[in-house]
Amino acid sequence: PGPPPGSPRASPDPRAELDSTVLLTRSLLEDTRQLTIQLKDKFPADGDHNLDSLPTLAMSAGALGALQLPSVLTRLRADLLSYLRHVQWLRRAMGSSLKTLEPELGTLQTRLDRLLRRLQLLMSRLALPQLPPDPPAPPLAPPSSTWGGIRAAHAILGGLHLTLDWAVRGLLLLKTRL
C-alpha cells in the first residue's frame, strides 16, 4: 500500500457529537416536561408515584463533579434503555386510556430511541467500554387498573424527567473534559 491520499472528514468529531447529544437530550427533556404537564392536567396526580421496575436516579447533581465519561455514558445508556422499554409498555398497555397523549408519547419514544443511538455512537467513537445492557428484565405486568396505569405513567415521566435533567448536566460537564 502506498502513501495515503488522505480523506475528507467523514462524520462529526466526538466533541461535536457530544454537543448534538446535549441538544437532543435538552429537547427530549422539554418534550417530557410538556407531556408531564399534559398528563397532570388530564389525570391529576395525588402526590409522587413510584414504579419498582424503574431505575433509581443515577446521581445527584452535586455529585456530578466526580464522575468520569465512561461511567456517565454507560449508566445513562442503561437507564434510558429501561425508560424506552417502559414507554413502549405504557403505549401498549394503556393505548385507549392515554389516547389523548398518544401522538406525543410516540414522538417521545422515537426521540428516546434516537438519543440512545447517539450515545451508542459516541461511545463507539471514543472506544469506551460497551458494557452489555442489564440482563432482560421479566416482562412488565399489565397495570391492574386504568388508574394503576395512569399512576405508572406519572412515575415513568417523572423519573425520565429527572434522569434527563441529570444527563444534560452530566454531559455538559463532561464536554469540558473531552
Partner: antibody
C-alpha cells in the same frame, strides 16, 4: 484532510517482535478511539485491538491477547502496536483506524517467515 | 468463521439494486449495538460507507443505504455502477468478545 500513516512493518522471523506506529493528522486524534485491524492476504478484515480516546481502556482479539500491546501518545498524535512472539499466521496488512472506525490508514505489511 | 455472517458474493448489472445482508446474534447486532458498513475497493484501504445502521458520512452517495432489524442488518445499493465493484464488510460491537467484529465480507461484481 484526515491522514493516518502507518510505519514499522516488514519481514520478521517467527518468535520475533515489531512495533507499528501510526501518525495522525487533520483531526483531533485525542478525541477518538484508536484501532488496529489486519487483513491477511486474500482474506477479510480482522479486528486486532482498540484503545479508548484517553488510553484508559484497551481490548484485544483473543488471537493476539498476551502477545500484542496497543498504546497511544496523544501529545504526539500517534498510535502504537507492539507485537511480540510473532507467528506465521500474523502475516497481514495492518491498518490503523480511528473512531467507529471512521478513518483508516493505507496499511503496512507485516510478513512473519523464516 | 466470522461472528457476523455475510454472503461471500453478490452481483448485479448497471442500474440494478442489490442488497447485502449481515446476520448476527443477541450479543452483537441484537444487543442495541450499531452496525457499520465499509467498502474496500481493490488494492485500497477500507472506507466507512454507513455508520449507526443507516447514517451516511459526507461524500457517500445516497445510492447507498443501510437498515437494521433484530439481529440482522442490510446494505442496499441502488443504481449500481461499475465503480461499486468492491468488497463490502459489516461490523458491530460484540459483548461476548468485548470488541468490534467484522463480517466475512461480500465481493460485489458488476456484470
Amino acid at each position: 484532510e484526515v491522514q493516518l500513516l502507518e510505519s514499522g512493518g516488514g519481514l520478521v522471523q517467527p518468535g520475533g517482535s515489531l512495533r507499528l506506529s501510526c501518525a495522525a493528522s487533520g483531526f483531533t486524534f485525542s478525541s477518538y478511539g484508536g484501532h488496529w485491524v489486519r487483513q491477511a492476504p486474500g482474506k477479510g478484515l480482522e479486528w486486532v485491538a482498540v484503545i479508548s480516546y484517553d488510553g484508559s481502556y484497551k481490548y484485544y482479539a483473543d488471537s493476539v491477547k498476551g502477545r500484542f500491546t496497543i498504546s497511544r501518545d496523544n501529545s504526539k498524535n500517534t498510535l502504537y502496536l507492539q507485537m511480540n512472539s510473532l507467528r506465521a499466521e500474523d502475516t497481514a496488512v495492518y491498518y490503523c483506524a480511528a473512531g467507529v472506525p471512521d478513518y483508516w490508514g493505507q496499511g503496512t505489511l507485516v510478513t512473519v517467515s523464516s | 468463521q466470522s461472528v457476523l455472517t455475510q454472503p461471500p458474493s453478490a452481483s448485479g448489472t448497471p442500474g440494478q439494486r442489490v442488497t447485502i445482508s449481515c446476520s448476527g446474534s443477541s450479543s452483537n447486532i441484537g444487543s442495541y449495538y450499531d452496525v457499520h458498513w465499509y467498502q474496500q475497493l481493490p488494492g485500497t484501504a477500507p472506507k466507512l460507507l454507513i455508520y449507526s445502521n443507516e447514517e451516511r458520512p459526507s461524500g457517500v452517495p445516497d445510492r447507498f443505504s443501510g437498515s437494521k432489524s433484530g439481529t440482522s442488518a442490510s446494505l442496499a445499493i441502488s443504481g449500481l455502477r461499475s465503480e461499486d465493484e468492491a468488497d463490502y464488510y459489516c461490523a458491530a460491537w460484540d459483548d461476548s468478545l468485548s470488541g468490534p467484529v467484522f463480517g466475512g465480507g461480500t465481493k460485489l461484481t458488476v456484470l
